[in-house]
Interface confidence: low
Amino acid sequence: IPVIEPSVPELVVKPGATVTLRCVGNGSVEWDGPPSPHWTLYSDGSSSILSTNNATFQNTGTYRCTEPGDPLGGSAAIHLYVKDPARPWNVLAQEVVVFEDQDALLPCLLTDPVLEAGVSLVRVRGRPLMRHTNYSFSPWHGFTIHRAKFIQSQDYQCSALMGGRKVMSISIRLKVQKVIPGPPALTLVPAELVRIRGEAAQIVCSASSVDVNFDVFLQHNNTKLAIPQQSDFHNNRYQKVLTLNLDQVDFQHAGNYSCVASNVQGKHSTSMFFRVVESAYLNLSSEQNLIQEVTVGEGLNLKVMVEAYPGLQGFNWTYLGPFSDHQPEPKLANATTKDTYRHTFTLSLPRLKPSEAGRYSFLARNPGGWRALTFELTLRYPPEVSVIWTFINGSGTLLCAASGYPQPNVTWLQCSGHTDRCDEAQVLQVWDDPYPEVLSQEPFHKVTVQSLLTVETLEHNQTYECRAHNSVGSGSWAFIPISAGAHTHPPDEFLFTP
């Protein structure tokens, strides 16, 4: 490690004094210090002498001696104060540039260490430092503003108390640059545009960045458009805006528009599509099947997608029957806008009642006319069953009526003993009726079928059961012959209550 003579960490001299700094190392040595006048350098092998015979306040600073050949990179330093009663500060730079959150060193070096107790940092014109300005002072290096912020870009002065007065340094301009996180932020408005030929249109491309140095342009189908640029600064961001105004659009204006912005960090682009149409349009569609089947008591949401330009002038849901003249409650109708030209309308039908089966129509209107989309809602019901004993053409017959939707299937069971429901162990005989007679089958209503079981003689210690089932559920009715006639048993549970 080189050695400096005099072997003191700091040296205090008066202006005009002669100063000699000698550095000795094992090999050749070099001096490094603040740029200042009047120094003479003399090198002789492993020693180097820095001297002046007229020291000034500008010679104040730290002088470092290094040995370039030393693999450990050792160095020695001495700090020189030239205490000038009229010049307490030696300012090494009048402009300091840092990025946000870096420490900013304002290099005003104190020329007299005795003054350290009365130093302060101020903004020019006697303004106080901004609140939360966190700074420290080193007489060797100056003031350091820690984690500098953009707003702290100001002109500063170093102040020292000399003879009861505040003596300021020349001003130091601090420029705190925003750290540019990436390419400029972009917005292109609208995200999609539709116009009828002859209408006016506006497309706005804007870019913003913490730094003013960026470019922005708008292009149509890869052709750059010449548009005047508006510039602004707010919320600590620079903004550049390009506005394309079209008084009367035509088909050649249609196509892809891209907003592109770039800076040193790279490029950002965003696009939108402009459609020009001959006339107004209104299209209704649904992702759902227009024919809906739902079990009674359950809920259903009917959804209609609307694509329209110009915007809708009116819309509503209507119940077209056949059961009642009720209309859907407005509170159950919901509209959501996917984007400017596409909307979704939903009708919520919770806990459906029998009287709510039927046709539901969504109607919408815009300058292009009226459009409607109709859903057909059929309710599913589990079967209801009843059995009676009758004579048909002189023959004793059990007549089973089953009502439900979808159309129920019918099965007859004969079992031993008297029971409300035949179980497997008791079953004596089973008959499937693949084609029961359909008694009624109207749209949106239950289907009622009838099945006949001809019985020559009723066995008194036996039960005859009619079972019906469909995709929703099943129902049954037990018929128990008794000596005085016949006795019927509906199931213990009444399986369906509308």
């Epitope: 009365g118 302060s120 006697g126 901004m130 609140r131 420290s136």
Partner: antibody, heavy 125, light 107 residues
């Protein structure tokens, strides 16, 4: 204990010069960062800042009155003096002196009026 | 000069009420703002400095907030001794300027 007390004439004639003295104790105006200021308040109206003087003899005046105001200090007597020339009836007010409390390094030496005198009423008539 | 606009100029409130007084500066004053309380015939008393720092000995029901150009003095629960006139003061830039004052009266 910090105390300040204003003294001066209760009545002055228009065009005359007003001289007010603020005598203080409990602090020294040689202490780094210390200051004393003058403030006035016309009857029923808001406060108006007039002038400041700092430990290092730095002086600041309200520009609307600057040519009429002079502030000075006598640290040996613990006094600050304010003179106001060419007095007018609109200058009728209660005049207060107040201490600007010290802030030690590394915070910049600027603060607010933390201790006030009781005020002295000056009528210009 | 920086103008300080204080509002309201007066208000009526009851003991226990929460009271808010605002000061609007004509330009950024970087939190260099103080709040004072003045009772009739008395000198002003420092309550808050640096916009939000509570002066020693001032009850904690007083608080200051704000930044940039907008600042607020809040009394969380008004006490009988709080009925007075309140002033703000900016010392960001010379000339130092006071607000027009807010008189807090008993409802």
């Amino acid at each position: 204990e910090v105390t300040l007390k204003e003294s001066g004439p209760a009545l002055v004639k228009p065009t005359q010069t007003l001289t007010l003295t603020c005598t203080f104790s409990g602090f020294s105006l040689t202490t780094y960062g210390m200051g004393v200021g003058w403030i006035r308040q016309p009857p029923g109206k808001a406060l108006e800042w007039l002038a400041n003087i700092w430990w290092d003899d730095d002086k600041y005046y309200n520009p609307s009155l600057k040519n009429r105001l002079t502030i000075s200090k006598d640290t040996s007597k613990n006094q600050v003096v304010l003179t106001m020339t060419n007095m007018d009836p609109v200058d009728t007010a209660t005049y207060y002196c107040a201490r600007i409390g010290p802030i030690k390094y590394p915070t910049a030496p600027y603060r607010y009026f933390d201790f006030w005198g009781q005020g002295t009423m000056v009528t210009v008539s | 000069d920086i103008q300080m606009t204080q509002s309201p100029s007066s208000l009526s409130a009851s003991v226990g009420d929460r009271v808010t007084i605002t000061c609007l500066a004509s330009e950024d004053i970087y939190d260099n703002l103080a709040w004072y309380q003045q009772k009739p015939g008395k000198a002003p008393k420092l309550l808050i400095y640096y916009a939000s720092s509570l002066q020693d000995g001032v009850p904690s029901r007083f608080s200051g907030s704000g930044s940039g150009t907008d600042y607020t003095l809040t009394i969380s629960s008004l006490q009988p001794e709080d009925f007075a006139t309140y002033y703000c003061l900016q010392d960001s830039e010379y000339p130092w300027t006071f607000g027009g004052g807010t008189k807090v009266e008993i409802k």
